[in-house]
């Protein structure tokens, strides 16, 4: 039950996170004109990854796409790439996790396969979230650098007859949406990875036999039971020190430790 809840919650959190990453990527307000000391200009400028917008005081807004690819700063291209990779990985992760959900039955899919898929989607969500956080952070760093550069330019002597007022840009709403969304996707991914451990079936190679050694309460189980995560083939028999002799059925009737994670 706990596993199903963790997996379901992980899926929902990741879904919200990826929707947020998509929203942030599409938003125009990655950087907005700094209005700290009263607006210097009668127009408000804000920029996204794909276009730049100008809003006049009347409310009239006009946006222009960045129609060049080669003329754009490398950092902007890098941020675009990170966000797109994040979206693609997240989307694939969502698709995989839908089939991995314990509450959804697809044919005779084994728990080991579901565990596999849950872990895969979890890793995808983690990488997706990291990509979004990295993309947003790179852009934020770029803004901070440019902000202080333009502030320095404002206070240095301006030569020549024609002066230009530096427009400074600060963090736009999209950055905060991106950070939160990236964080949610990351959390969702971690939850999926945790759920994966609980999904792994507890298998036995063969019936365990209990030997009662005189004066000692030690059960030697030649076959032991292996906790298979469903990844790789672990055929080695392990001796299990149990601190007391029990039948295999007794041992297996106890809840798996993974159910409580």
């Amino acid at each position: 039950m706990a596993v199903t809840a963790c997996q379901g919650l992980g899926f929902v959190v990741s879904l919200i996170g990826i929707a947020g990453i998509i929203a942030a990527t599409c938003m125009d307000q990655w950087s907005t004109q700094d209005l700290y000391n009263n607006p210097v200009t009668a127009v408000f400028n804000y920029q996204g990854l794909w276009r730049s917008c100008v809003r006049e005081s009347s409310g009239f807004t006009e946006c222009r796409g960045y129609f060049t690819l080669l003329g754009l700063p490398a950092m902007l291209q890098a941020v675009r790439a990170l966000m797109i990779v994040g979206i693609v990985l997240g989307a694939i992760g969502l698709l995989v996790s839908i089939f991995a959900l314990k509450c959804i039955r697809i044919g005779s899919m084994e728990d080991s396969a579901k565990a596999n898929m849950t872990l895969t989607s979890g890793i995808m969500f983690i990488v997706s979230g990291l990509c979004a956080i990295a993309g947003v952070s790179v852009f934020a760093n770029m803004l901070v650098t440019n902000f202080w550069m333009s502030t320095a330019n404002m206070y240095t002597g301006m030569g020549g007859m024609v002066q230009t007022v530096q427009t400074r840009y600060t963090f736009g709403a999209a950055l905060f949406v991106g950070w939160v969304a990236g964080g949610l996707t990351l959390i969702g991914g971690v939850m999926m990875c945790i759920a994966c451990r609980g999904l792994a079936p507890e298998e036995t190679n063969y019936k365990a036999v209990s030997y009662h050694a005189s004066g000692h309460s030690v059960a030697y189980k030649p076959g032991g039971f292996k906790a298979s995560t469903g990844f790789g083939s672990n055929t080695k028999n392990k001796k299990i020190y149990d601190g007391g002799a029990r039948t295999e059925d007794e041992v297996q009737s106890y809840p798996s430790k993974h159910d409580y994670v």
């Epitope: 607006p39 200009t41 009668a42 127009v43 730049s52 100008v54 005081s57 009347s58 006009e62 007022v165």
Partner: antibody
């Protein structure tokens, strides 16, 4: 059609205050900025400030800070400008104007102007 | 404040003549975000309020005759009247519509011979 009708000419004493009105019609009053412009006799135009009736936000030219106060009455779609501590160099024609939508902050409609004469 | 300088201060022309009025700003009025220049031209006839002629440096207001053309970018702007008519007798003002406070040029008085 859009109209801005200003109050009549004013003759005031130095040190006194005066309130000029600008009654608007033909458009949604709360959705457009109202600007006020000063023109001294035979001289150029000077921007005083602007007021947004929708939110009550005002921006002033520093030269008129403390001199002009912009307000509006939404129920009657009327904008007001109060001029205080009047001096002789406040004698001028004052225009109220509307900022157009999608016209680069330009003023597309103007009132006929109110003449203010400061004299003892 | 942005200084708007208009030249000449007055101009006498004959009807049908082409006339060019100049306006220079102390700072660039070009907005890089939308590639528009926030400069406006007004016409003020004697005893009347000013009238909007051109905004965004080159966009003609509706109802304005097409003999009026605005051009220029950055800091240098011109208003061209291709064929002056008697009714064009007026004072022409340019205005910075970008930086606060909005500032007007001193005006160019167009007189007809």
């Amino acid at each position: 059609q859009v109209q801005l009708k200003q109050s009549g000419a004013e003759l005031v004493r130095p040190g006194a205050s005066v309130s000029l009105s600008c009654k608007t019609s033909g458009y949604i009053f709360t959705s457009y900025w109202i600007h006020w412009v000063k023109q001294r006799s035979g001289q150029g135009l000077e921007w005083i400030g602007r007021f947004y009736p929708g939110t009550g936000t005002a921006y002033y030219n520093e030269n008129f800070e403390g001199k002009a106060t912009l307000t509006a009455d939404r129920s009657s779609s009327t904008a007001y400008m109060q001029l205080s501590s009047l001096k002789s160099d406040d004698s001028a024609v004052y225009f109220c104007t509307r900022e157009g939508y999608g016209k680069g902050n330009a003023m597309d409609y103007w009132g006929q102007g109110t003449s203010v004469t400061v004299s003892s | 404040d942005i200084v708007m300088t208009q030249s000449p201060s007055s101009l006498t022309v004959t009807t049908g003549e082409k006339v060019t009025l100049s306006c220079k700003s102390s700072q660039s009025l070009l907005q890089s975000g939308n590639q528009k220049n926030y400069l406006t031209w007004y016409q003020q006839k004697s005893g009347q309020p000013p009238e909007l002629l051109i905004y965004w440096a080159s966009t003609r207001e509706s109802g304005v005759p097409d003999r009026f053309t605005g051009s220029g970018s950055g800091t240098d702007f011109t208003l061209t009247v291709s064929s002056v008519q008697a009714e064009d007798l007026a004072v022409y003002y340019c205005q910075n519509d970008y930086y606060f406070p909005f500032t007007f040029g001193g005006g160019t008085k167009l007189e007809i011979k």
